[in-house]
Amino acid sequence: AITEAREEAKPYPLFPGPFPGSLQTDHTPLLSLPHASGYQPALMFSPTQPGRPHTGNVAIPQVTSVESKPLPPLAFKHTVGHIILSEHKGVKFNCSISVPNIYQDTTISWWKDGKELLGAHHAITQFYPDDEVTAIIASFSITSVQRSDNGSYICKMKINNEEIVSDPIYIEVQGLPHFTKQPESMNVTRNTAFNLTCQAVGPPEPVNIFWVQNSSRVNEQPEKSPSVLTVPGLTEMAVFSCEAHNDKGLTVSKGVQINIKAIPSPPTEVSIRNSTAHSILISWVPGFDGYSPFRNCSIQVKEADPLSNGSVMIFNTSALPHLYQIKQLQALANYSIGVSCMNEIGWSAVSPWILASTTEGAPSVAPLNVTVFLNESSDNVDIRWMKPPTKQQDGELVGYRISHVWQSAGISKELLEEVGQNGSRARISVQVHNATCTVRIAAVTRGGVGPFSDPVKIFIPAHGWVDYAPSSTPAPGNADPVLII
């Protein structure tokens, strides 16, 4: 049977303690036993059968006395079975046993919930020898109990390879409710129901839960822990907490903010990181995400030229890393650029528009209608062409580069000529006779050299041959033209 000794009880102390079988909570003995002088334990009171040793784990010594009487069985004396006290209070409890003096080196160990208590515990063992027996009292004290001290404590003693075990002493530390699960902050969709959970434990039980939303109690009557609150939906941010009540009082959980997911704020600080002729690298600072992670972003690009048709190019990209290279742009052009990002709720407004320009680029097309003539009288090759369309010059034309390759009998020689931007014709000297001259022309801007035109070949005969017709850029798909005179 378990007896309860409550901290509130103030039993009449028979004698000042501590004594074998005594218990102290807050240094007030709840059960004290008398003793004779010399600390020899007298009768030990048991909650069930006063004066009888307990019938638990007993060792029966095999040694007999001079008169050959067998020694009585060894057992721990009864003590209080159940101690209930408040957190942070002090408690002291003990085990006592009387051991015949024939046994040497007896030690008592304390165990809690099946594990030996070692080290930094306030355990004291005192010995009170008499003629035939030694009374051993093992005391265990805790100065400021915590919940972790809850449990079942026992004493163990080894004698003659026998283990003697005391009855358990149950320590129950009571206090304010302790949260094992508190509501968590959440981001929720507007007007959509969601759940919050709150769980708290004693002792003492039961623990009752009240929910609070924005300082108003949601349930006017308590709900047993654990409690799940179904919030029927919110239209604006709210703060929730739960109150846990037991007989010791109340504990309030942390307040958690429940946010309403919304469309993000527009990105800010859109800036140009780098410009080339056909691309612009931009970065931006994302706006507030509206309590929902960004999914992707959209870059909107429109020509700033007032004469343009105002069409908008849209480039979609991932939300990270807040960087995007806009490609396929025209060179030397002005653009307005805006960025918008989306989360699960929708798209943000567009950021403030910024102006950006592409740089000059190398022309994107070659000169057109390249024609090559041999002027034998002056021993020159005349070249004519048409300049590429202005739109495709990708910059201000600064001139042309002419490549002419001379091939004859295993010899090949390439020469380059630079021509000013004004002309659309050039004359080059014949380098080798009885050879093929292959001519290609590229337009040049400050942005670089554009692509070369398709090759035009002309055969340069030995001296004294007749005049001949010009050679021209081939129509698409034709083989390289070679004019043989």
Epitope: S216, E220, Q221, T230, P232, G233, T235
Partner: antibody, heavy 118, light 106 residues
């Protein structure tokens, strides 16, 4: 299913007392608070207050402090409204209604007409 | 205490029409509940917590709003919807009801 059944109509003289009952069934009586709502003839609804069926503690709206008493007999899952020193202006239909979270009144009694007339 | 003002006080409507009843609170509230009361009957919960349909209520009823302005909407009115409608706030004690809106079917 959940039901709230109220006692029948009462005709009382000014100065007398009346006790209206509201018997609940179909749920655990002590889980939900019991409210009382008054509706004077041709008028709207007025919340009188509620009683905590778990602790027995009553809460009264300001206009109903004094002559109005809420009480319980949990053994028979019944809530009571007692009005003392009746006046003519107490003539009304009195409803009991339960609420849970967020104080919406999901279940109502059928109403009890209390007529105060000399 | 929070005062709830419903408008209109009275409305006469033909079947299949759309009806909107508004409830304005004297200060911000967390939720608004709506009830329907027919003559000589108890009130019946229609909408709980601003926008949630109570069980067994036809889907032609809906609720919306936040802060101080809330709305009960009846799409395609039916003859059986003739009743008085009340709003009730949650968020500040004491609980209060609106004065009611009487709906008559022409």
């Amino acid at each position: 299913q959940i039901q709230l059944v109220q006692s029948g109509s009462e005709l009382k003289k000014p100065g007398a007392s009346v006790k209206v009952s509201c018997k609940a069934s179909g749920y655990t009586f002590t889980n939900y608070g019991m409210n009382w709502v008054r509706q004077a003839p041709g008028q709207g609804l007025e919340w009188m207050g509620w009683i905590n069926t778990y602790t027995g503690e009553p809460t009264y709206a300001d206009d109903f402090k004094g002559r109005f008493v809420f009480s319980l007999d949990t053994s028979v899952s019944t809530a009571y409204l007692q009005i003392s020193s009746l006046k003519a202006e107490d003539t009304a239909v009195y409803f009991c209604a339960t609420y849970g979270h967020y104080a919406w009144f999901a279940y109502w009694g059928q109403g009890t007409l209390v007529t105060v007339s000399s | 205490e929070i005062v709830l003002t419903q408008s209109p006080d009275f409305q006469s409507v033909t079947p299949k029409e759309k009806v909107t009843i508004t409830c304005r609170a004297s200060s911000s509230v967390s939720y608004m509940h709506w009830y329907q009361q027919k003559p000589d009957q108890s009130p019946k919960l229609l909408i709980k917590a601003t926008s949630n349909l109570a069980s067994g209520v036809p889907s032609r009823f809906s609720g919306s709003g936040s802060g101080t302005d809330f709305t009960l909407t009846i799409n395609s009115l039916e003859a059986e919807d003739a009743a008085t409608y009340y709003c009730q706030q949650w968020g500040t004690k004491p609980l209060t009801f609106g004065q009611g809106t009487k709906l008559e079917i022409k």
